[in-house]
């Protein structure tokens, strides 16, 4: 080994070196939280970049860059260090227009903490292992969601566009002429029935067990879907999102009420099956796999 490499190895294995890097990262994180940093922090930034560059150079000199088995780039944790340094120099010396987007990558410096703290490294390792084991469960989950999304698509396509429409028009107005001019919230509120405090027109349906319109209003299929057009079963992707929402139970009762009002109470069966299978079974299956992966990692 050359004298330079010997010195690099000595520095690398020294506990003070690890302490220096850890303190640098933590101090850097504190500086990153500053709202309006003063001008002198720019010099501190350069110091941090210098320390990180020194750390990487020491590692490269001690272990080699990428050819051997235990070299710098063969360790995935060092990829993070390498990316942090590359972005530090990119944002500083290269004019890339929208620098603020690139500066976001400075946050990756906080992740360097993981590679320095051994306990944290183990936990993250376990997390990565659990993600690998989750692949089968994820495939099953996506498959189940896709199947139910397709069923939802067939059952409820376009149903959430059903609205209660006013039964009195001007002489020159017809349904189609109104459909072509509906734009503002004011227009919608003029022609459709809104419950007090509601941001969406009252939903209705054409089957006997679906929601009915109040007197002076008729059910029609016009305009956009509820929740600014984000809640619907009109395409596979929107249906998939709705099913994901049911699985995660994210304000699912609102989606349930909207759909039942537009399609009919019979379709409650669909929601019961999805909640039982998606929300109770699949979610717990995912948790079980994660728990197993942690258990294996601990052993």
């Amino acid at each position: 080994f050359s004298p330079l490499r010997r010195i690099s190895i000595k520095i690398l294995v020294h506990s003070l070196f690890s302490m220096l890097i850890m303190c640098t990262i933590l101090t850097n994180c504190i500086f990153m939280t500053m709202n309006n940093p003063p001008d002198w922090t720019k010099n501190v930034e350069y110091t941090f970049t210098g320390i990180y560059t020194f750390e990487s150079l020491v590692k490269i000199l001690a272990r080699g860059f990428c050819v051997g088995e235990f070299t710098f780039l063969r360790d995935p944790w060092n990829w993070l260090d390498f990316v942090v340094i590359v972005f530090a120099y990119l944002t500083e010396f290269v004019n890339l227009g929208n620098v603020s987007a690139l500066r976001t990558f400075r946050v990756l410096r906080a992740l360097k903490t993981i590679s320095v703290i051994p306990g944290l490294k183990t936990i993250v390792g376990a997390l990565i292992q659990s993600v690998k084991k989750l692949s089968d469960v994820m495939i099953l989950t996506v498959f189940c969601l896709s199947v139910f999304a397709l069923i939802g698509l067939q059952l409820f396509m376009g149903n959430l566009k059903h609205k209660c429409f006013r039964n009195s028009l001007e002489n020159n107005e017809t349904l189609e002429s109104i459909m072509n001019t509906l734009e503002s919230e004011e227009d919608f509120r003029k022609y459709f029935y809104y419950l007090e405090g509601s941001k969406d027109a009252l939903l209705c349906g054409f089957s006997t067990d679906s929601g009915q319109c109040p007197e002076g209003y008729t059910c029609v299929k016009i305009g956009r879907n509820p929740d600014y057009g984000y809640t619907s079963f009109d395409t596979f992707s929107w249906a998939f999102l709705a099913l994901f929402r049911l699985m995660t139970q994210d304000y699912w009762e609102n989606l349930y009420q909207q759909t039942l009002r537009a399609a009919g109470k019979t379709y409650m069966i669909f929601f019961v099956v999805v909640i039982f299978l998606g929300s109770f079974y699949l979610i717990n299956l995912i948790l079980a796999v994660v728990a197993m992966a942690y258990e294996e990692q601990n052993q």
């Epitope: 396509m157 376009g158 149903n159 059903h162 429409f165 039964n167 009195s168 028009l169 017809t174 349904l175 189609e176 002429s177 459909m179 054409f206 007197e215 002076g216 008729t218 059910c219 029609v220 299929k221 016009i222």
Partner: nanobody
Framework: EVQLVESGGGVVQPGGSLRLSCAAS?????????TGWYRQAPGKQRELVAR???????QYADSVKGRFTISRDNAKKTVYLQMNSLRPEDTALYYC?????????????????WGQGTLVTVSS
């Protein structure tokens, strides 16, 4: 294709009467906001004559008020226009309009669905 069947048109003398019928008998017609009669005289724009909403309330053009009466038979899915005291200026092609929701089998669709038209001629 959705079809409205119109009938009852013909030639009549001034002061005479006619009864027009518009049948939306197809199962595709689900629910209307209104079903109405419109007319188009040669060289003129199509205008509203009368319409009846699904709850039974009616609306008439000023020129026909007191002379024409619109009614509906929900069981037969038919709308009638009883035209009395006809005048030469009532001569036109009368169209039936179903403004509401139809079923395509796969989904519901709302819009305006027009008939082919029936000719009413008032002359001596």
């Amino acid at each position: 294709e959705v079809q409205l069947v119109e009938s009852g048109g013909g030639v009549v003398q001034p002061g005479g009467s006619l009864r027009l019928s518009c049948a939306a008998s197809s199962r595709q017609f689900i629910r209307d906001v209104f079903t109405g009669w419109y007319r188009q005289a040669p060289g003129k724009q199509r205008e509203l004559v009368a319409r009846i909403y699904n709850e039974g309330n009616t609306q008439y053009a000023d020129s026909v008020k007191g002379r024409f009466t619109i009614s509906r038979d929900n069981a037969k899915k038919t709308v009638y226009l009883q035209m009395n005291s006809l005048r030469p200026e009532d001569t036109a092609l009368y169209y039936c309009l179903f403004s509401g929701t139809i079923s395509t089998g796969r989904e519901y669709r709302s819009g305006d669905y027009w008939g082919q038209g029936t000719l009413v001629t008032v002359s001596s």
